[in-house]
C-alpha cells in the first residue's frame, strides 16, 4: 500500500476526436509522473507534445514507444499517456469559418470568420454573414461586429 503522501494530479487523457478528458489520478511523487497508474494501464513515461503511445500501456511495465501524430490531421499540445492523438479541428465553411493557422503536431487549428462574416462572441464556433445595407452603411462589418446600416429616408451628410 502507498504510505507516502498522496497528491491529486490532473493528467490529460487524449481521445481521437481531438478532445481532452481530464481525470484525477493519485500519484506519490508531486514532481514526477513515473509509474502512473492510468485507466487500468501502467505508464512510466508520458509522450511529449506532438506524439502518442504506439499502443496502450500494460500493467507489466512494458513501455510502448512514442510515435508522431499525423501532421495536419492530429496533434497533442501537452505531455500525455494516451495511445491516441487529438483530432485537428476543421474550420467548417458552413459555419462561416476558415483556417487562420493550420494544425501542426503540437497545436490545434485556429479558425476565423470567412470574409463578409462576423462573430461577436469570444469563442467563435459559428460566424454569421454580414448584413447587406439597402440604404447605405454607417459602419462596415468587421470580424467581431455586424454592419450598421442607415435607415430608409435617413439623410447623408
Amino acid at each position: 500500500r502507498l504510505s507516502s503522501k498522496s497528491v491529486n494530479a490532473q493528467v490529460t487523457d487524449i481521445n481521437s476526436k481531438g478532445l481532452e478528458l481530464r481525470k484525477t489520478v493519485t500519484t506519490v511523487e508531486t514532481q514526477n509522473l513515473e509509474g502512473l497508474h492510468h485507466d487500468g494501464q501502467f505508464c512510466h513515461k508520458p509522450c511529449p507534445p506532438g506524439e502518442r503511445k504506439a499502443r496502450d500501456c500494460t500493467v507489466n511495465g512494458d513501455e510502448p514507444d512514442c510515435v508522431p501524430c499525423q501532421e495536419g490531421k492530429e496533434y497533442t499540445d501537452k505531455a500525455h499517456f494516451s495511445s491516441k492523438c487529438r483530432r485537428c479541428r476543421l474550420c467548417d465553411e458552413g459555419h462561416g469559418l476558415e483556417v487562420e493557422i493550420n494544425c501542426t503536431r503540437t497545436q490545434n487549428t485556429k479558425c476565423r470568420c470567412k470574409p463578409n462574416f462576423f462573430c461577436n462572441s469570444t469563442v467563435c464556433e459559428h460566424c454569421d454573414p454580414c448584413t447587406k445595407c439597402e440604404h447605405g452603411i454607417i459602419k462596415e462589418c468587421t470580424l467581431t461586429s455586424n454592419t450598421k446600416c442607415k435607415e430608409e429616408g435617413s439623410r447623408s451628410n
Epitope: 481521437s16 476526436k17 478532445l19 499525423q70 490531421k73 479541428r89 474550420c91 458552413g94 459555419h95 469563442v123
Partner: antibody
Framework: QVQLQQPGAELVKPGASVKLSCKAS????????MQWVKQRPGQGLEWIGE????????NYNQKFKGKATLTVDTSSSTAYMQLSSLTSEDSAVYYC??????????????WGTGTTVTVSS | DIVLTQSPASLAVSLGQRATISCKAS??????????MNWYQQKPGQPPKLLIY???NLESGIPARFSGSGSGTDFTLNIHPVEEEDAATYYC?????????FGGGTKLEIK
C-alpha cells in the same frame, strides 16, 4: 441543394467484393469529409470510417479495417467504399454522409439515400 | 468503445403531448464544457436525418418543437408538441471518441 446520390441495390456473391459509390452535388466536395455508416436490417447504425476528399486521408473504425476501403474521385465529386471478402454479415444498407464540425463536435448533416447490399449465392 | 443506451426502446405518445427520449453514455462525452452528442430521426425506408448537434443546437430547417439537452453521460431529446409526422426511430450519436457510436434507437409511435 446538397445531395448525396447512391445506387439503390447491389447483389453480390459470398467471397466477392463490391464497390459502392456516393456522388455529391450542391457543395464543394473537397471542403467536407465523407462518412460511411452501416445499417443491418431492422438494426441500428454503425460507423465504418471517414475520408478527407482534399487529400484522401482515411480514418477507420477498427472493426472495419481490412473489410472497407474508402477512396474518392474529386473530378467527379464521388466517394467510394469497397467491401471485400463478403459474407452474409455484410448484407446491410450502407450510407454515405457529409461530415460537419462544430467546435470539434463532428456530426453528419446530409445523408445519401443508401445502397442495399445483399450477399447471396 | 463508448456505449450509448437509449430508453425507452419504444414509446407511444398522444398527439400534442411531450415525447422524452433518454440517451446514457458509458463514459462522459463532454470536453471543456461542450457536449459531443448528436440526435437523428429515421423513418422506414429513409436515411437518418440530423435533428440536433452538440447536444442542444437545432439543425437548420428542423421545427422548434425538437430540443436537446444534457451533459456528461445523460442526454435527452424532447419533442413537444408531438405531431403525426414525428413517428420514427430516433438515434443518439457521440463524437467524443473513436469509434463514433450510435444508440440502439427509440421507436416513437403517435397515438
Amino acid at each position: 441543394q446538397v445531395q448525396l446520390q447512391q445506387p439503390g441495390a447491389e447483389l453480390v456473391k459470398p467471397g466477392a467484393s463490391v464497390k459502392l459509390s456516393c456522388k455529391a452535388s450542391g457543395y464543394t466536395f473537397t471542403s467536407y469529409w465523407m462518412q460511411w455508416v452501416k445499417q443491418r436490417p431492422g438494426q441500428g447504425l454503425e460507423w465504418i470510417g471517414e475520408i478527407d476528399p482534399s487529400d484522401s486521408y482515411t480514418n477507420y473504425n477498427q472493426k472495419f479495417k481490412g473489410k472497407a476501403t474508402l477512396t474518392v474521385d474529386t473530378s467527379s465529386s464521388t466517394a467510394y467504399m469497397q467491401l471485400s471478402s463478403l459474407t452474409s454479415e455484410d448484407s446491410a444498407v450502407y450510407y454515405c454522409a457529409r461530415n460537419r464540425d462544430y467546435s470539434n463536435n463532428w456530426y453528419f448533416d446530409v445523408w445519401g439515400t443508401g445502397t442495399t447490399v445483399t450477399v447471396s449465392s | 468503445d463508448i456505449v450509448l443506451t437509449q430508453s425507452p426502446a419504444s414509446l407511444a405518445v398522444s398527439l400534442g403531448q411531450r415525447a422524452t427520449i433518454s440517451c446514457k453514455a458509458s463514459q462522459s462525452v463532454d470536453y471543456d464544457g461542450d457536449s459531443y452528442m448528436n440526435w437523428y430521426q429515421q423513418k422506414p425506408g429513409q436515411p437518418p436525418k440530423l435533428l440536433i448537434y452538440a447536444a442542444s443546437n437545432l439543425e437548420s430547417g428542423i421545427p422548434a418543437r425538437f430540443s436537446g439537452s444534457g451533459s456528461g453521460t445523460d442526454f435527452t431529446l424532447n419533442i413537444h408538441p408531438v405531431e403525426e409526422e414525428d413517428a420514427a426511430t430516433y438515434y443518439c450519436q457521440q463524437s467524443n471518441e473513436d469509434p463514433r457510436t450510435f444508440g440502439g434507437g427509440t421507436k416513437l409511435e403517435i397515438k
